[in-house]
């Protein structure tokens, strides 16, 4: 653990109620294939514990979806995965729509310091998939 | 070799018959820019042969393929990604449908132990493209 | 640095004129989340300093997009990652058409030697965001 | 602890409009939408829309745009439905409801308010 | 819209039985589905959510199952207390759509 290998792997535990964009995340062997080693959750939301450059990557699907339901609606759903705190650090690290499409994934390197709390809004009515192997968001410390 | 580093990025090879959906692959420098190292294939599929936490990622394009031709099947096109040997251990990784795409990319965090086998399961009718810019399956041991 | 874990992250910086199809990009901590470690710009096209095994990764969003617009287009928009000088060692790593998308994201294994030039070719008239959450392209050393 | 509490029932004639009103106690009213959903006499459920009570966007179900309006007063930690051009038809309890952690999941209740249209 | 199709309409049951209520919902709802009880003269009060998630002070009598289509609420033991209209709801999606309700009485 002493080399910094910071890595997690979360699955959707819930949406937040409907003001909050929010997906709430859970990760831990007795739940599945998901786990944290290093980064840990507060409040369904990773925090990161060791600074760094990261590879974060996600994929998000879409429960109830087909090409025009994702089109049909007049608000395009988003997803965005950011810093949401310390408030001075918020950005937003990456950003995908889905366009007649019900699932996005990519990923990217970024930095991240001990204490940034990274969040994934999605924004729109439609609710993401909870199957483990259709949506889930991870982090991976790759140097310092 | 010791620190663990396996790594493996494959090409396709061919796809099954009509009732196998597994992707077949190969690998090795005089096929082009494929290759394993640590992996090995076993008649086509990816055998993990260190235990430990890797990077899994894919993409698989549809050789003939417009925006249509994805969405008037009446099934759609999926990928899935999954461990289907030694049956105690068979699970689904990943998965993506084409909803009006003709590519699917993703990659995620997932514990794997020697001997566990990867299957890429592509359903539907469509065919993936053998171009190795368009279709390549990979995977990356990231720590123990 | 000795370790070898040269890496990257790059924003897009302009596209060029008509006629030539590579992305310029960008990096440095001055212009926010991208970052340079080991690899270098040459006339915003990013060449390895380190031979190895890399992860490469890319997302692109289309500027002003919808389903639409990337349909109606005859000559579709592509996205192609590749080798592009020295000219011995030409070739295209990673390929993916927007097909009713406005964003592609993909990630690949590839050796990649010292003083390859990597280009990102995108063809078509649509243009990419420059957000730098929607826009980005970077490598990582992975193994020798 | 959290607490909506909708104004009495009302009787009215057809073309009247009424405005049933649902304060709220024992959160921030911002933090949360708040939904509204009928229920005419011995039938089931109906979600009618919510309102964004930071925003104040309202959403409608269809059936429900037009003579239905939701409101709010912030600072009274207050939602309103408005019905106009009543009709015999939209007879029914209306009940404001709210989530707690998950989407669409409805925790709080209001007490319900029974609209009676008839002439 | 999500059509869902709740039955029976009507049962009744004896204090100590085992009660079962079916959903079924016009397409997948990927577990997105939850149960309320009303009393007569009462607001509605949530059972069940994500279909099988007990709420916070419910007894463990009560339990849902399901998955895609098909969901099920069930109460192990009637009690006296339990008498009321029980709806599904399923929450995937925009227009929230309800269940007709089944209303539970004693025998």
């Known amino acids: 653990e002493s080399l910094g290998w910071d890595i997690a792997e979360l699955q959707l535990n819930h949406t937040g109620p409907q003001q909050d964009p929010r997906l709430y995340w859970q990760g831990g062997p007795a739940l599945g294939r998901s786990f944290l080693r290093g980064p840990e959750l507060d409040k369904g939301q990773l925090r990161i514990r060791r600074d760094g450059i990261y590879m974060v990557h996600i994929q998000v699907t879409l429960a109830i979806c087909s090409s025009t339901s994702t089109s049909r609606h007049h608000h395009p759903t988003t997803l965005a995965v950011g810093i949401c705190s310390p408030a001075s650090r918020s950005i937003s690290l990456l950003r995908l729509s889905f366009h007649q499409g019900c699932t996005i994934a990519s990923q990217r390197l970024t930095p991240l310091a001990r204490g940034d709390t990274l969040c994934t809004n999605l924004t729109g009515t439609l609710l993401p998939s909870r199957n483990t192997d259709e949506t889930f968001f991870g982090v991976q410390w790759v140097r310092p | 070799e010791s620190l663990g580093w396996d790594i493996a990025e494959l090409q396709l090879n061919h796809t099954g018959p009509q009732q196998d959906p597994r992707l077949y692959w190969q690998g090795g420098p005089a096929l082009g820019r494929s290759f394993l190292r640590g992996p090995e294939l076993d008649k086509g599929q990816l055998r993990i042969r260190r235990d430990g936490i890797y990077m899994v990622h894919i993409q698989v394009t549809l050789a003939i393929c417009s925006s249509t031709s994805t969405s008037r099947h009446h099934h759609p096109t999926t990928l899935a990604v999954g461990i289907c040997s030694p049956a105690s251990r068979s699970i689904s990784l990943l998965r993506l449908s084409f909803h009006q795409g003709c590519t699917i990319a993703s990659q995620r965090l997932t514990p794997l132990a020697r001997g566990d086998t990867l299957c890429t399961n592509l359903t539907g009718t469509l065919l993936p493209s053998r171009n190795t810019d368009e279709t390549f399956f990979g995977v990356q041991w990231v720590r123990p | 640095e000795s370790l070898g874990w040269d890496i990257a992250e790059l924003q897009l910086n302009h596209t060029g004129p008509q006629q030539d199809p590579r992305l310029y990009w960008q990096g440095g901590p001055a212009l926010g989340r991208s970052f340079l470690r080991g690899p270098e710009l040459d006339k915003g096209q990013l060449r390895i300093r380190r031979d190895g095994i890399y992860m490469v990764h890319i997302q692109v969003t289309l500027a002003i997009c919808s389903s639409t617009s990337t349909s109606r287009h005859h000559h579709p928009t592509t996205l192609a990652v590749g080798i592009c000088s020295p000219a011995s060692r030409s070739i295209s790593l990673l390929r993916l058409s927007f097909h009713q998308g406005c964003t592609i994201a993909s990630q690949r294994l590839t050796p990649l030697a010292r003083g390859d030039t990597l280009c990102t070719n995108l063809t078509g008239t649509l243009l990419p965001s420059r957000n730098t959450d929607e826009t980005f392209f970077g490598v990582q050393w992975v193994r020798p | 602890q959290v607490q909506l509490v909708q104004s009495g029932s009302e009787l009215k004639k057809p073309g009247a409009s009424v405005k049933v009103s649902c304060k709220a106690s024992?959160?921030?009213?911002?933090?949360?939408?708040m939904n509204w959903v009928r229920q005419a006499p011995g039938q089931g459920l109906e979600w009618m829309g919510w309102?964004?009570?930071?925003?104040?966007?309202?959403t409608y179900a269809d059936g429900f745009t037009g003579r239905f309006v939701f409101s709010l007063d912030t600072s009274a930690s207050t939602a309103y439905l408005q019905i106009s051009s009543l009709k015999a038809e939209d007879t029914a309890v209306y009940y404001c409801?709210?989530?707690?952690?998950?989407?669409?999941?409805?925790?709080?209740w209001g007490q319900g308010t029974l609209v009676t249209v008839s002439s | 819209d999500i059509q869902m199709t709740q039955s029976p309409s009507s049962l009744s049951a004896s204090v100590g039985d085992r009660v079962t209520i079916t959903c079924q919902a016009s397409?997948?709802?990927?577990?997105?589905l939850n149960w309320y009880q009303q009393k007569p003269g009462k607001a509605p009060k949530l059972l069940i959510y994500?279909?099988?998630r007990l709420h916070a002070g419910v007894p463990s009598r009560f339990s849902g199952s399901g998955s895609g289509t098909d969901y099920t609420f069930t109460i192990s033991s009637l009690q006296p207390e339990d008498i009321a209209t029980y709806f599904c709801?399923?929450?995937?999606?925009?227009?929230?759509?309800f269940g007709q309700g089944t209303k539970l009485e004693i025998k």
């Open positions: 409801a709210r989530e707690e952690d998950y989407r669409y999941v409805f925790n709080y």
């Open positions: 024992g959160y921030t009213f911002t933090n949360y939408g």
């Open positions: 309102i964004n009570t930071y925003t104040g966007e309202p």
């Open positions: 397409q997948d709802i990927s577990n997105y």
């Open positions: 994500d279909t099988s």
């Open positions: 709801q399923q929450g995937v999606t925009l227009p929230l759509t």
